[in-house]
């Protein structure tokens, strides 16, 4: 169990930013923050819930835009943003810090939401290390922050996954629960068996190798499907495999915005303050009644207080309240390299030649779905289709009827009749062949290939 | 011209489950819009039921929400309601409409379809 | 749910005189992120479906005659048909689409 702990220094006009308020005159506002952590360093989707935690900060002071005036750093809220942690700390992690600004003004239906920045970090954190600091920019704005991980005793280490005892163990109380803030002194940690995993095990003799929850193995290297003590959190026994107390799942109030944690068989419960909710009270009380769908976007969930919602987004835009435009193109839905143009309303694609469809998925030199008429069969070559038609036939699809004696077909100045079946062609004397190409030799055998038997030469050769 | 055409069963028994279809001509349902159920009981006021994106999300009345499933058939252009355990109460005209996202208004009307809930 | 009350349920006026419907709602349909309110007025006439006339409270549809008007904010809503003519005996319903969707129980115009 742990602590992921943030810190706002600044919001502000970033460099060649905005160097005027980039708002019309309006009445009071404030900001706040939500902060959000998402385990992993991979690109999750922009929906997945904040398995790691979520919290909201408090409200910064009351200021007024001057739309006229230099645009100064926002007046902030007071304190860290916390967000507990119960199990191991990750160690890589995203981190999404949302700036909303509240305006204060005679609205009906109360005040309104809008979210003017939002920046991602995906980082690699040890837990117990120093502050480290960033600066992010989203758009003409510019966020300071800095953010640590510190485990909550007794949890240890860099992901808080090792327990420590104190020196004055008899001083602390049953079994492992944390100690007094002065007694955290923890023993160095005993040399485990060879071999012990350094991510799943942990000892607290010498040469012995115990497994975390969801462990087992002399090496604590094989993961454990079911387990009959599921639930409590903390060291497994040797001899049970069941796991000694660790630390409470209320210790330490995980639950957010001044929610009450009350504990429950494995688990806690936060019963959340109106206006949040969530399994730590870390979101904030926004609802359908707000009208929180940016873009047209439909809302949907309860209506009151303490419900949950989502958007239901139109075409083009995204995130939790569809204020994200969606640059469609960039998933590149053109096909055959179409031309990709995002119309606000709908996609559109330019096709290359030789490509249709509202996708340009439809190639029209493929043979696939392609007649060729009259008999003509279809061949593909070279990105191109063509058809080889039929005696008697020509053009692209072979719909034209062609003249099969116009292109002369036969040789050494026989002569061409047109029959239903194809050309039959009448050789000059001393050829013959289907197109009197072979020329006959003068003892009356001709050359290859040999006239087939009964065929005179001279005589009309019919051309299949 | 986006033409919209209830289809299904007149007569439904009750405790049944009412079936309709909805076949959408001159827009693709997978473009834009919400895909809507609207009912009119006989000489009463509109009901909206509920609704299926143009992406497939769903939302539905909560006072029928335990009843009603809504889907689509993108490859016919078509999106479906059903709802179960009929009573007669149910017996209404049934609309097909699209909503605009931009406007939140009920675009255009299917002409209806009248489904009789009686044994 | 929000809930959506019309009144009159039926209203009589005589042909070029002014029709007035009002509508209330249970809670605000103003949003202050778009500045909109979220309520539409729709024409149903005999064996037909509705029709759009109005959305956002005052906005009128492409195609409405502009003798159609709506106004209003917040929680009251009105719509009004400044010279009834004969073409406009109908239900008129309003409707509210700030949360999920719910409509008005109707109000039938006649001629006077």
């Known amino acids: 169990a742990g602590v992921f702990e943030l810190q706002i220094h600044s919001f502000g006009p970033g460099p060649g930013g905005a160097p005027r308020s980039p708002y019309s005159a309006r009445g009071p506002c404030r900001l706040f923050f939500r902060v959000c952590l998402k385990p992993g360093l991979s690109e999750e989707a922009a929906e997945s819930p904040c398995a790691l935690g979520a919290a909201l900060s408090a409200r910064g002071p009351v200021y007024t835009e001057q739309p006229e005036a230099p645009a100064p750093d926002l007046p902030l809220p007071n304190g860290l943003l916390q967000v507990p942690f119960r199990d191991a700390w990750p160690g890589t992690f995203s981190l999404i810090i949302e700036t909303w600004r509240e305006e204060l003004g005679d609205q009906i239906g109360g005040p309104a939401w809008s979210l003017l920045a939002r920046v991602t970090r995906r980082r690699r954190l040890a837990a117990g290390g120093p502050w480290a600091g960033d600066i992010q920019r989203a758009g003409a704005w510019e966020l300071r922050f800095s953010y640590r991980a510190r485990c909550e005793l007794p949890a240890v280490g860099t992901a808080c996954t090792r327990l420590c005892r104190p020196r004055s163990a008899s001083r602390c109380g049953p079994g492992l629960r944390p100690c007094a803030p002065l007694e955290d002194e923890c023993e160095a940690p005993p040399v485990c068996r060879a071999g012990c995993s350094l991510e799943h095990g942990f000892c607290e003799q010498p040469g012995e190798c115990r497994c975390l929850e969801g462990w087992t193995g002399p090496l604590c290297m094989v993961p454990v499907s079911t387990s009959s003590c599921l639930g409590l959190r903390g060291p497994s026994s040797t001899t049970t495999g069941c796991l000694v107390p660790g630390p409470g799942p209320c210790d330490g109030n995980p639950c957010a915005n001044g929610g009450s944690c009350s504990e429950t068989p494995g688990s806690f419960e936060c019963t959340c303050p109106r206006g949040f909710y969530g399994l730590r009270c870390e979101v904030s009380g926004v609802t359908c009644a707000d009208g929180p769908c940016f873009n047209g976007g439909l809302c949907v969930g309860g209506a009151d207080p303490d419900s949950a919602y989502i958007c239901h987004c139109p075409p083009g835009f995204q995130g939790s309240n569809c204020e994200k435009r969606v640059d469609r193109c960039s998933l590149q839905p053109c096909r055959n390299g179409g031309l990709c143009l995002d119309l606000g309303h709908a996609l559109r694609c330019r096709c290359r030649a030789g490509f249709a469809g509202p996708r340009c998925e439809h190639d029209l030199n493929d043979c696939a779905g392609r007649a060729c008429a009259n008999g003509g069969t279809c061949v593909e070559g070279g990105g191109a289709h063509r058809c080889s038609c039929a005696l008697g036939f020509g053009g692209r699809d072979c719909r034209e009827r062609a003249d099969p004696c116009a292109a002369r077909p036969c040789a050494h100045g026989g002569r061409c009749y047109a029959h239903f079946s194809g050309l039959v062609c009448a050789c000059a004397p001393g050829y013959m062949g289907a197109r009197c190409e072979f020329p006959v030799h003068p003892d009356g055998v001709s050359a290859l290939p040999a006239a087939p038997p009964g065929l005179r030469p001279g005589d009309p050769q019919r051309y299949p | 011209q986006v033409q919209l055409q209830e289809s299904g069963p007149g007569l439904v028994k009750p405790s049944e489950t009412l079936s309709l279809t909805c076949t959408v001509s001159?827009?693709?349902?997978?473009?834009?819009?919400?895909w809507n159920w609207i009912r009119q009981p006989p000489g009463k006021g509109l009901e909206w039921i509920g609704y299926?994106?143009?992406?497939?999300?769903?939302n539905y009345n909560p006072s029928l929400k335990s009843r009603v499933t809504i889907s689509r058939d993108t490859s016919k252009n078509q999106f479906s309601l059903k709802l179960s355990s009929v009573t007669a109460a149910d017996t209404a005209v049934y609309y097909c409409v699209y909503g605009d996202f931009n406007r939140h208004a009920m675009d255009y009307w299917g002409q209806g379809t009248l489904v009789t809930v009686s044994s | 749910d929000i809930v959506m009350t019309q009144s009159p349920d039926s209203l009589a006026v005589s042909l070029g005189e002014r029709a007035t419907i009002n509508c209330r709602s249970s809670q605000s349909l103003f949003n202050s992120r778009t500045r909109k309110n979220y309520l539409a007025w729709y024409q149903q006439k005999p064996g037909q479906p509705p029709k759009v006339l109005i959305y956002?409270?005052?906005t009128r549809e492409s195609g409405v005659p502009d003798r159609f008007s709506g106004s209003g904010s917040g929680t009251d809503f009105t719509l009004t048909i400044s010279s009834l003519q004969a073409e406009d005996v109908a239900v008129y319903y309003c409707e509210q689409s700030f949360y999920l969707f719910t409509f008005g129980q109707g109000t039938k115009v006649e001629i006077k």
């Open positions: 956002w409270a005052s």
């Open positions: 299926i994106t143009y992406d497939g999300s769903t």
């Open positions: 001159g827009y693709s349902i997978t473009s834009d819009f919400y």
